[in-house]
Amino acid sequence: VPRWRQQWSGPGTTKRFPETVLARCVKYTEIHPEMRHVDCQSVWDAFKGAFISKHPCNITEEDYQPLMKLGTQTVPCNKILLWSRIKDLAHQFTQVQRDMFTLEDTLLGYLADDLTWCGEFNTSKINYQSCPDWRKDCSNNPVSVFWKTVSRRFAEAACDVVHVMLNGSRSKIFDKNSTFGSVEVHNLQPEKVQTLEAWVIHGGREDSRDLCQDPTIKELESIISKRNIQFSCKNIYRPDKFLQCVKNPEDSSCTSEI
């Protein structure tokens, strides 16, 4: 008789989740010499230990502490790029501008990027059928708590000028409920971070509006400046040209506004 299983509203654990995490870990540590000391089997065991046999609506940041410890990594604190609702362009940018880092350019971010996972209370099984949805089921689910934990630590590590890429095509360019708006903004340390520079990425080719005037950007500005951090905003009118100019800064067309 099949055992009753909790039906959650979100998609289940990504297929071949353990193998994917392990393979990503091996690949990352091969590419990044500073992380070669990492034992990927221990990383997987710590990752698994954070959610296996636990109720998937009752996960805490403490559950991830062993994994955080194993994945401790130093990135240049003044080369951090945060993003909100525009992950692909942010990743394309750091692939070209190799001295800048998104969270997904770190080991822990790389391991979990685009994956879903959850377990079941009192069983060692991984749930491949469904996992809790943040809105419909619960916020303290394994995936949300993981990203909240790593995002908080990433923001806390930042210093000097921190950049954030924001999607100018969204109705809320800055969304207080996004990971950036709810976690990272509040965990930038004013003692270390002097300036947050927002890059607002335009979607339409003919869009010449100053999206730095958007009410949600002014809301971000207010939150940031009240925390003793300066705020700078720049429109990126042509993201394609922007990337091209990052690749070839000497190009004569790259002196004009992008």
Epitope: Q194, D210, Q213, K218, E221, S222, I224, Q230, F231, C233
Partner: antibody, heavy 119, light 107 residues
Framework: QVQLVESGGGVVQPGRSLRLSCAAS????????VHWVRQAPGKGLEWVAV???????DYNAAFMSRFTISKDNSKNTVYLQMNSLRAEDTAVYYC?????????????WGQGTLVTVSS | DIQMTQSPSSLSASVGDRVTITCKAS??????LAWYQQKPGKAPKLLIS???SLETGVPSRFSGSGSGKDYTFTISSLQPEDVATYYC?????????FGPGTKLEIK
């Protein structure tokens, strides 16, 4: 290019009021904060107030009760209303642009306008 | 308010000399320090922000260093056009306050 031009200075009696203007060009007040800084004759610099691009203001508490900063975005002009003036308010008053959107350092300054409070 | 002190209050040096000015805050200002140059009868000019970042167009002979409460401004090789008064400014907390200035002259 960025330019700031102050006006409205002059000789005024103690207890009277004066309104200084700062006409900005080469940038928009919708994009940058503008500060007032003063310098008494032969003395150092003293930060007075700032008006941010959204219209909110911060003041040096020493001036908050007597001075008011405001702006007219359509004229791209910032104002400093100074009431109940005292002899010790005699100074050159500079307006200056925030280096970045909400910046606390000042990258462009006007030439200053001299305010003399004397009976 | 955060008090800023500068030393020396004035100094005289020869062309080509290395000149150092110090600025001390009454509390930790976490590198939120700017340096300005003011020539006689002129408005101040921003040289350095964030304790160490040289503004665009400012000659590389100017530099800034320091952390916590203590900061230093250096001119590696003094030029005649550097005659001016130099001010530090903290931008950690409002009211943003300036040092009293250091008047630099050529011997």
């Amino acid at each position: 290019q960025v330019q700031l031009v102050e006006s409205g200075g002059g000789v005024v009696q103690p207890g009277r009021s004066l309104r200084l203007s700062c006409a900005a060009s080469g940038f928009s007040l919708l994009s940058y904060g503008v500060h007032w800084v003063r310098q008494a004759p032969g003395k150092g610099l003293e930060w007075v107030a700032v008006i941010w691009r959204g219209g909110s203001a911060d003041y040096n508490a020493a001036f908050m009760s007597r001075f008011t900063i405001s702006k007219d975005n359509s004229k791209n002009t910032v104002y400093l209303q100074m009431n109940s003036l005292r002899a010790e308010d005699t100074a050159v008053y500079y307006c200056a642009k925030s280096m970045i959107t909400t910046g606390f350092t000042l990258d462009y300054w006007g030439q200053g306008t001299l305010v003399t409070v004397s009976s | 308010d955060i008090q800023m002190t500068q030393s020396p209050s004035s100094l005289s040096a020869s062309v080509g000399d290395r000149v150092t000015i110090t600025c001390k805050a009454s509390e930790d200002i976490y590198n939120r320090l700017a340096w300005y140059q003011q020539k006689p009868g002129k408005a101040p000019k921003l040289l350095i922000s964030g304790a160490t970042s040289l503004e665009t167009g400012v000659p590389s002979r100017f530099s800034g260093s320091g952390s916590g409460k203590d900061y230093t401004f250096t001119i590696s090789s003094l030029q005649p056009e550097d005659v001016a008064t130099y001010y530090c400014q903290q931008f950690w907390n409002t009211p943003w306050t300036f040092g009293p200035g250091t008047k630099l002259e050529i011997k």
